[in-house]
Structure formats: structure tokens, C-alpha cells
Interface confidence: medium
């Protein structure tokens, strides 16, 4: 059965915490992803960016969790209007920026 939105967001945040805390080397071998605007539609935009990273087991669970938040199917090569034009950042920075943003949403009670 579906988990409450607050629980799902908490679990996603804790997975992002887990990734950032356990970094001993550059995440996903320093792979770069498109930066996104952390405003509306953040879950789909984040998935559209991260789905282009393959062969990185550290973020596979995050990709699956984001898929549960995004109402439409996302596939590699799909680019959102929320993408920051021509700006790529390391996966590690992307994950941490997403973590900080989602923690703010959680504090403010914005679970969807």
C-alpha cells in the first residue's frame, strides 16, 4: 500500500543523507548531471537529471524513490524545462543541493 507523503519524503531525505554521509571518494566517479531549478516539479526534474547516470549503484535507490514521486514516466535523454540551461554539476553537489531543498520542504510541511 502507498506510504503517506510525509513518510515517503522522510525516507527520500534519509537516503540522500546516507549518500552524502558515506562518501569516501567522488560520487559516481565524478559524473556530471544537468543542474535544475529547485522550485516546482523538483522530483521529476531531479529524476530526469539523475536518470542519465548509469552504472552508479550509490544512487540507484534514490532514482527509484524519485520515480515514485514523479507522476509521469521518465526516460534517459529527456530534458525538463526546469533544467538550468547549459549548467552541469557533479552528482555529489546535485544530491546535496537536493537534500537541502527537500529538508526545507519537509520542515515547511510540503510533502507533495
Amino acid at each position: 500500500s502507498p506510504v503517506p507523503p510525509s513518510t515517503a519524503l522522510k525516507e527520500l531525505i534519509e537516503e540522500l543523507v546516507n549518500i552524502t554521509q558515506n562518501q569516501k571518494a567522488p560520487l559516481c566517479n565524478g559524473s556530471m548531471v544537468w543542474s535544475i531549478n529547485l522550485t516546482a516539479g523538483v522530483y521529476c526534474a531531479a529524476l530526469e537529471s539523475l536518470i542519465n547516470v548509469s552504472g552508479c549503484s550509490a544512487i540507484e535507490k534514490t532514482q527509484r524513490m524519485l520515480n515514485g514521486f514523479c507522476p509521469h514516466k521518465v526516460s534517459a535523454g529527456q530534458f525538463s524545462s526546469l533544467r538550468v540551461r547549459d549548467t552541469k554539476i557533479e552528482v555529489a553537489q546535485f544530491v546535496k543541493d537536493l537534500l537541502v531543498h527537500l529538508k526545507k520542504l519537509f520542515r515547511e510541511g510540503q510533502f507533495n
Epitope: E14, T20, Q21, K24, K96
Partner: antibody, heavy 122, light 108 residues
Framework: QMQLVESGGGVVQPGRSLRLSCAAS????????MHWVRQAPGKGLEWVAV????????HYADSVKGRFTITRDNSKNTLNLQMNSLRAEDTAVYYC???????????????WGQGTMVTVSS | SYVLTQPPSVSVAPGQTARITCGGN??????VHWYQQKPGQAPVLVVY???DRPSLIPERFSGSNSGNTATLTISRVEAGDEADYYC???????????FGGGTKLTVL
């Protein structure tokens, strides 16, 4: 308003014990991780211990492991630090501090008590 | 265990910008918090999660964090900003909190 008040400090001989308490008010105590942080005279901040919001996890600095015990009573909104086998190097101001809690990590310390002085001397 | 390195002291003239650094291995992957402590007082949180500010802290205080260095920036420094400043992270390898050694900010 939100407040933390420490008590129980004083002068104690090396090898003896002391129990510090921290009374919380103005917020939902049971939902926050709680920490003890100390500061020796003229020195920097040193983290001592944390207890999870529900008491399920406790972690200690290596310097106090096996000698200090952190506990909490959520029904009374109190945090405690039992300090045994005290040493001269434990002399410090002891602060309790509140930190929002995720499962794997603590957040920033957003509320601090005023501190209580512990002096270990013969 | 994880080590955070801060310069012991930083001096700045009133109205200028002070930058206090906090070095640590891959610190950019961690969330860094900063505290201000004035003599005889408890520490006060001034920046959390690298760059966020508690509601009562002036906009003059800001933070950044990438690579191996986190930085606390205080713009338009005032005499009242003179204090010790500490950076802090959570270290998952030891399940504990780590503080930097502290930086004494002197306003000339």
C-alpha cells in the same frame, strides 16, 4: 519561549562522579535529538554525547566513552549526563543543546543552554 | 576520525568583509553549520546546512561549501561581530559531531 537549563555542576575530586541535568521547556522535547557539548577554560567546543529523540541510540566522544552515560526522560522533559571516573581534563563548562534528528545524522544545534561549570580538582 | 581545520584568528576593519574558512577532506559532501560565541556566553547558530540562516541572524552572515573548504562570510563587519566562530559537521564514520578548533574574529 524555548529554553534549556543545565544544573548539577560543581567541584569534584578526580575519580568521583557527578550527574548533570538539563531541563527543557517551550518545545516538544520528545521529537528532538539532544546533545552534551563541553568547553574547557580558554579552549574550543568539544562534543561529548548524543541521544536520539526516542532514546534508541546513544553515541559518545572517544574521550568519555565508558565513563559517561547520557539518558533522557521524555515524560519529564529532562536530559541527563552521568559522569563517572572524572579526570582533571573533564574540567569544562557543559552545555546541553537541541538538534533536529534524522535517522542517520543530527542537524545543527539550534538551541543551547547557558552551561554549567564542572571542576575536577583534588 | 574526521578533522576540521580553522585559522586561529582573523582580523578585519569595520565595514569590511571577513571570511573564515573550515577545511576538511571532501567537506563539500557534508552539511556544515557555523556558530558564534561571545565571551561568557553560550554559542549561537548563525549558519546551518552550508548557507541557510536562522530567522534572527542578519543577512550579513552567509556561508558556502565546496571541495575541501567551507567558508563563513560576514559582510559589513561591525564591532559586535567580534567573537569566536566554530564550524561543525556530523561524522558518520564515528557517529558523532565534530567541531573545528575555532577562529577568533577581531574587529580592528
Amino acid at each position: 519561549q524555548m529554553q534549556l537549563v543545565e544544573s548539577g555542576g560543581g567541584v569534584v575530586q578526580p575519580g568521583r562522579s557527578l550527574r548533570l541535568s538539563c531541563a527543557a521547556s517551550g518545545f516538544t522535547f520528545r521529537t528532538y535529538g539532544m546533545h552534551w557539548v563541553r568547553q574547557a577554560p580558554g579552549k574550543g567546543l568539544e562534543w561529548v554525547a548524543v541521544i536520539w529523540y526516542d532514546g534508541s541510540n546513544k553515541h559518545y566522544a572517544d574521550s568519555v566513552k565508558g565513563r559517561f552515560t547520557i539518558t533522557r526522560d521524555n515524560s519529564k522533559n529532562t536530559l541527563n549526563l552521568q559522569m563517572n571516573s572524572l579526570r582533571a581534563e573533564d574540567t569544562a563548562v557543559y552545555y546541553c543543546a537541541r538538534a533536529p534528528q534524522w535517522e542517520l545524522t543530527a542537524e545543527a544545534f539550534d538551541i543551547w543552554g547557558q552551561g554549567t561549570m564542572v571542576t575536577v580538582s583534588s | 576520525s574526521y578533522v576540521l581545520t580553522q585559522p586561529p584568528s582573523v582580523s578585519v576593519a569595520p565595514g569590511q568583509t571577513a571570511r573564515i574558512t573550515c577545511g576538511g577532506n571532501l567537506i563539500g559532501s557534508k552539511l556544515v553549520h557555523w556558530y558564534q560565541q561571545k565571551p561568557g556566553q553560550a554559542p549561537v547558530l548563525v549558519v546551518y546546512d552550508d548557507s541557510d540562516r536562522p530567522s534572527l541572524i542578519p543577512e550579513r552572515f552567509s556561508g558556502s561549501n565546496s571541495g575541501n573548504t567551507a567558508t563563513l562570510t560576514i559582510s559589513r563587519v561591525e564591532a559586535g561581530d567580534e567573537a569566536d566562530y566554530y564550524c561543525q559537521v556530523w561524522d558518520s564514520s564515528s557517529d558523532g559531531v565534530v567541531f573545528g578548533g575555532g577562529t577568533k574574529l577581531t574587529v580592528l
